[in-house]
């Protein structure tokens, strides 16, 4: 399977909400012994590899924000902790999964990574990530709403091992 990032750049004004999205593509094994661990974290482009460093999002780690379920099942993060931080991650039946961030500030700017790990018999078998940039703008040049920029076809299917 692969992870696609429909948008590579989100440009938002302060105070707005945004939903960053990734999509699971390709054949997904729906066997009983297969589960998917999906999560989000912040990172940097890095001098070596994008998404190799895992930084928290609003002080919540990738463990705090993870979804753990089989195949294309729907799921949501545990509400209390994430919602106290203005965050919610979710996954639908079609392989889309997302993180919603409320009341954005400049401090939310940076690179965001989604990570999918396929787990068979309790062992990590395959992991892929996708990356996207969030720019939260202040001042007179800030847009009135979030503007999203589609990934190039090459970028949108990120199959780099995390």
């Amino acid at each position: 399977f692969k992870v696609a990032t429909p948008y590579s750049l989100y440009v938002c004004p302060e105070g707005q909400n945004v939903t960053l999205t990734c999509r699971l593509l390709g054949p997904v094994d729906k066997g009983h012994d297969v589960t998917f661990y999906k999560t989000w974290y912040r990172s940097s482009r890095g001098e070596v590899q994008t998404c190799s460093e895992r930084r928290p999002i609003r002080n919540l780690t990738f463990q705090d924000l993870h979804l753990h379920h089989g195949g294309h099942q729907a799921a949501n993060t545990s509400h209390d902790l994430a919602q106290r931080h203005g965050l919610e991650s979710a996954s639908d039946h079609h392989g889309n999964f997302s993180i919603t961030m409320r009341n954005l500030t400049l401090l939310d700017s940076g690179l965001y990574c989604c990570l999918v790990v396929e787990i068979r018999h309790h062992h990590s078998e395959h992991r892929v990530h996708g990356a996207m940039e969030l720019q939260v703008q202040t001042g007179k040049d800030a847009p009135s709403n979030c503007v999203v920029y589609p990934s190039s076809s090459q970028d949108s299917e990120n199959i780099t091992a995390a």
Epitope: S44, R45, E47, L60, G86, L106, S109
Partner: antibody, heavy 121, light 111 residues
């Protein structure tokens, strides 16, 4: 080891533009961090002016927004400050500095040595 | 703008004693549990040097004689025991809201 070095004219006439260059060695400005300009006035007051992020996104101090532009040349690993319509109030030591960007902590961890700029006719 | 009020403006301390510098922000500098408050030292003719970030984290290479504390709007920098090399200006700085702002500075001298 990452190092930053400011360069530019030490004397600028009122109403003209001030242009400074920060040359970064030991780290690519497109890899991570935000790259800032900060100035220190006579009497020691420090003022943050603005930054350009590793991805090229700029944020400016609202008080300077109408006069400031920060740009970069990634091939030379340099970033630049342009301040238009200067007055004697812009006389200061100008520093470029790196700050952590896109994480839980935001702070200036590497500074250039500074360059003194006097605005005078 | 968040106004950073530093006190005292100058401080004379005997070698080996404790120096305490305070900084008050005009509004909270908390960001989801992190205090976005820094402390810098500056010696004459040199740029500021980071000492403490996020209120209490000591920057790598900085002696553990330097301690930062506080949350919300009230912060302090403690230096103990004070050494001759600590003679400098000290600045607090917030990065919670643009424009990022600095305190007016505290000049540390030896008695």
């Amino acid at each position: 080891e990452v190092q930053l070095q400011e360069s530019g004219p030490g004397l600028v006439k009122p109403s003209q533009s001030l242009s400074l260059t920060c040359t970064v060695t030991g780290y690519s400005i497109t890899s991570d961090y935000a790259w800032n300009w900060i100035r220190q006035f006579p009497g020691n007051r420090l003022e943050w002016m603005g930054f350009i992020s590793y991805s090229g996104f700029t944020t400016y101090s609202p008080s300077l927004e109408s006069r400031i532009s920060i740009t970069r040349d990634t091939s030379k690993n340099q970033f630049f400050l342009q301040l238009i319509s200067v007055t004697t109030e812009d006389t200061a030591t100008y520093y470029c500095a790196r700050n952590h960007y896109g994480g839980s902590y935001w702070y200036f961890d590497v500074w250039g040595a500074g360059t003194s700029v006097t605005v005078s006719s | 703008d968040i106004v950073m009020t530093q006190s005292p403006g100058s401080l004379a301390v005997s070698l080996g004693q404790r120096a305490t510098i305070s900084c008050r922000a005009s509004e909270s500098v908390e960001y989801y549990g992190t205090s976005l408050m820094q402390w810098y030292l500056q010696k004459p003719g040199q740029p500021p040097k980071l000492l403490i970030y996020a209120a209490s984290n000591v920057e790598s290479g900085v002696p553990d004689r330097f301690r930062g504390s506080g949350s919300g709007t009230d912060f302090s920098l403690n230096i103990h025991p004070v050494e001759e090399d600590d003679i400098a200006m000290y600045f607090c700085q917030q990065s919670r809201k643009v424009p990022w702002t600095f305190g007016g500075g505290t000049k540390l001298e030896i008695k």
